[in-house]
Interface confidence: low
């Protein structure tokens, strides 16, 4: 699968998700650690069991499912609560449905998610790696009533699918509250009056207002009686009203932090999974940045520096002890142009982070136009173009002329090599998997490829031209203030 | 722009102020090459004569124009033939590309912006009291997939496939009167790409009523054809 599956099939022998707490809430011990418990199963003894970090696993085929050694010295191990994969049926509204049904309720064939024909759409799998938009299977990435798909019929853009409901109880949605916390999706109190004093209509009733927010359509949202609820990601709990002139209204729910909150005061929170606008910033090239941002410019989540999945790499806390490589925070251990990280998207190895450069004041600084170097091939050029044969090229291209991603210079798979490594050529700029020309090849910059059948190939690096202002590239960095 | 903030001067160097020949700002536009500006067709409904309009490039303030600002007459108007809300202006002389006047990039034909992509709108339009009037403002908004935007509680089926929605469903931030014709740009890899032309909305910055923008990628073939043949 091209995404980290956070659910288990059967006893979870093949579970490779990131749950790292036991069912009793104890943090798991790292599999590679010997404290507080000496493990019988470790990455060294069981290399194929996925014993990364401190994630729950089932290396011994335990019928009770994934488990881990705990960080509690008094409790050697404990089991983890991992959701069953919804492969044959769906819980709730099918947000985690993982099955292979690919026909709509009227029998239309589904359009593949990675296709834009016959219907152009914005649910692009590479931009939503955690939504599991595989092939043309029915999915629910957008809080619809149940899984759906775009159809192959040009006259019908999309339609719901008929997915059987699971008979097993749905997974717990976490703690519930009798007061308002956040947008109140877990509010389970008994308030049944709106802010202007209208009585709420029963969720199961269709008068005076017909609607689809029914207990049948939202079985996990506790649409009991006529109590205010937030089944669909609005700003706060709400209900349809018994006044035929007022279709629905928000409710006044006392806040969990004891001060009563009116709907006007409710901070409208971003819909789930919107990239948070991180307000911290970095100085210079960000080597000193020690903030907690862990999101890339395109909204991808960062991979933990000590993890080797989905990307194997050399930028570990052990190799770079002073670079602050904690958790999965954005960092710049290798003097790149700004903080970056490896991403949790298996198809995108690394990206820069969604961070701004700090400006001492709010005044804008006009960046000077790029300096044009005379074509001295020994002078490394930071731009994404080369002079001469590109021996001094230090740009960021990392794919070959055929579009194949380059192998990291420090990596030994899929190709083992010893001549051109960062250690043997410390001044050749063999950083990450960037195209380089360490041997002055007349063909220009090249790299080892990630295609096991192709050892190396050249990269398509253009010759540098005189400075010009390219479209879409302001010379003053925009402020990028958040929308609200 | 309602909400958002005042932009750093010249940080959106493709932003155009479309003006009457007497100098009054009434719409935005986007410089897409030294000789061409993209705007909304409804901005040109007052007059079919190019001489009725002029464009201002490189400005930050709406009224006290800085010395480096370029003021250029319009020589021809091209309305999209199927009457979609998009139009091209040919300038009577090419703009001088400087650090303050740079075109935006066009998307590849039929490119679709992913749901929830964060993009930016800019303009000198109505601020509805949210400060910054008279200065170029910007705001960051997520694109909302048409399927969601067309839901009953949002724009209820009104958005066409040649349009896109962007906005916070909580309201508070939006383009508004006077921003029409201006850009919605999204950052892709290393540059800003013009994905939308500000078109219409149900009021400005109202909850559950995102703004609607013409989807530029659906008109790239037309745009490039007009530029090539004229």
């Amino acid at each position: 699968k091209v995404y980290l599956s956070e659910c288990k099939t059967g006893n979870g022998k093949n579970y490779r998700g990131t749950m790292s707490k036991t069912k009793n809430g104890i943090t798991c011990q790292k599999w590679s650690s010997t404290s507080p418990h000496r493990p019988r199963f470790s990455p060294a003894t069981h290399p194929s069991e996925g014993l990364e970090e401190n994630y729950c696993r089932n290396p011994d085929n335990d019928p009770q499912g994934p488990w881990c050694y705990t960080t509690d010295p008094e409790k050697r191990y404990d089991y983890c609560d991992i959701l069953e994969c919804e492969e044959e049926c769906m819980h709730c509204s099918g947000e985690n449905y993982d099955g292979k049904i690919s026909k709509t309720m009227s029998g239309l064939e589904c359009q593949a998610w990675d296709s834009q024909s016959p219907h152009a759409h914005g649910y692009i799998p590479s931009k939503f790696p955690n939504k599991n938009l595989k092939k043309n299977y029915c999915r629910n990435p957008d809080r619809e009533l149940r899984p759906w798909c775009f159809t192959t019929d040009p006259n019908k853009r999309w339609e719901l699918c008929d997915i059987p409901r699971c008979t097993t109880p749905p997974p717990s949605s976490g703690p519930t509250y009798q007061c308002l916390k956040g947008t109140g999706e877990n509010y389970r109190g008994n308030v049944a009056v709106t802010v202007s004093g209208h009585t709420c209509q029963h969720w199961s009733a269709q008068t005076p207002h017909t609607h689809n927010r029914t207990p049948e359509n939202f079985p996990c949202k506790n649409l009991d009686e006529n109590y205010c609820r937030n089944p669909d990601g609005k700003r706060a709990p709400w209900c349809h009203t018994t006044n035929s002139q007022v279709r629905w209204e928000y409710c006044k729910i006392p806040s969990c932090d004891s001060s009563p909150v009116s709907t006007e005061q409710l901070a409208p929170t971003a819909p789930p999974e919107l990239t948070p606008v991180v307000q911290d910033c970095y100085h210079g090239d960000g080597q000193s940045y020690r903030g907690t941002s862990s999101t890339t410019t395109t909204g991808k989540k960062c991979q933990s520096w000590s993890s080797m999945t989905p990307h194997r790499h050399q930028k570990t806390p052990e190799n770079y002890p002073n670079a602050g490589l904690t958790m999965n925070y954005c960092r710049n251990p290798d003097a790149d142009k700004g903080p970056w990280c490896f991403t949790t998207d298996p198809s995108v190895r690394w990206e820069y982070c969604n961070l701004k450069k700090c400006s001492g004041t709010e005044a804008s600084v006009v960046a000077p136009p790029p300096v044009v170097l005379l074509p001295d091939v020994e002078t490394p050029s930071e731009e994404d173009c080369m002079f001469g044969n590109g021996k001094g090229y230090r740009g960021k291209r990392a794919t070959t002329v055929t579009g194949t991603p380059c192998q990291d210079w420090a990596a030994q798979e899929p190709h083992r090599h010893s001549i051109f490594t960062p250690e043997t050529n410390p001044r050749a700029g063999l950083e990450k998997n960037y195209c380089r020309n360490p041997d002055g090849d007349v063909g220009g910059p090249w790299c080892y490829t990630t295609n096991p059948r192709k050892l190396y190939d050249y990269c398509d690096v253009p010759q540098c031209a005189a400075p010009s202002f390219d479209c879409g590239k302001p010379q003053v960095e925009p402020k990028k203030c958040p929308g609200r | 722009v309602v909400g958002g903030c005042v932009a750093h001067p010249h940080s959106w160097p493709w932003q155009v102020s479309l003006r009457t020949r007497f100098g009054m700002h009434f719409c935005g536009g986007t410089l897409i090459s030294p000789e061409w500006v993209l705007t909304a067709a409804h901005c040109l409904e007052k007059s079919p004569r190019p001489s009725s309009y002029k464009v201002i490039l490189g400005a930050h303030q709406e009224v006290n124009l800085e010395p480096h600002v370029q003021e250029i007459e319009v020589s021809r108007l091209f309305l999209e033939p199927t009457r979609k809300d998009i139009a091209l202006l040919k300038l009577s002389s090419p703009a001088v590309i400087t650090d303050k006047v740079i075109p935006a990039c066009l998307p590849s034909p039929n490119y679709v912006v992913a749901d929830r992509t964060e993009c930016f709108i800019t303009g000198w339009g109505e601020t509805q009291g949210t400060f910054g009037a008279g200065l170029l403002k910007e705001a960051q908004l997520p694109v909302i997939e048409n399927k969601v935007c067309n839901r009953y509680e949002f724009l209820n089926g009104r958005v066409q496939s040649t349009e896109l929605c962007a906005g916070h469903l909580a309201g508070g931030t939006d383009s508004c009167q006077g921003d029409s014709g201006g850009p919605l740009v999204c950052f892709e890899k290393d540059k800003y790409i013009l994905q939308g032309v500000t078109s219409w909305g149900l009021g400005c910055a109202r909850p559950n009523k995102p703004g609607v923008y013409v989807r530029v990628s659906r008109f790239v073939t037309w745009i490039e054809g007009v530029m090539r043949n004229n």
Epitope: - | H42, N156, R158, Q177, W200
Partner: nanobody
Framework: QVQLVESGGGLVQAGGSLRLSCAAS????????MGWYRQAPGNQRELVAS???????NYAGSVKGRFTISGDSAKNTVYLHMNSLKPEDTAVYYC????????????????WGQGTQVTVSS
């Protein structure tokens, strides 16, 4: 203000067909939805069919399968194709449009036509 010009009404035998059309014109506006209502003597005005800018259609239960609404956004015109007409379809048919004025405050404004008589004889 938006002007609506309706045409196509008339007298027809039961089982016959008619096509109503309605064209909108006026100061700078954008149509976001168009539709047809009807009112028979002594009855309330009722929605027959509507179509939005995005192509979403909506029909009254009594006309589903017999009437088809379509629009031409380039001409700001809406059509109502009426097949298998019944005597109970006899009414004055009113065209309606929801528009947003480009130079206004963006609020939707509804506009009504004068109506065109449709009479179905048995």
């Amino acid at each position: 203000q938006v002007q609506l010009v309706e045409s196509g009404g008339g007298l027809v035998q039961a089982g016959g067909s008619l096509r109503l059309s309605c064209a909108a014109s006026g100061r700078r506006f954008m149509v976001v939805a168009m539709g047809w209502y009807r009112q028979a003597p002594g009855n309330q005005r009722e929605l027959v069919a509507s179509i939005t800018n995005g192509g979403t259609t909506n029909y009254a239960g009594s006309v589903k399968g017999r009437f088809t609404i379509s629009g031409d956004s380039a001409k700001n015109t809406v059509y109502l194709h009426m097949n298998s007409l019944k005597p109970e379809d006899t009414a004055v048919y009113y065209c309606t449009t929801d528009v947003v004025f480009r130079d206004g405050n963006g609020q939707i404004q509804s506009n009504w036509g004068q109506g065109t008589q449709v009479t179905v004889s048995s």
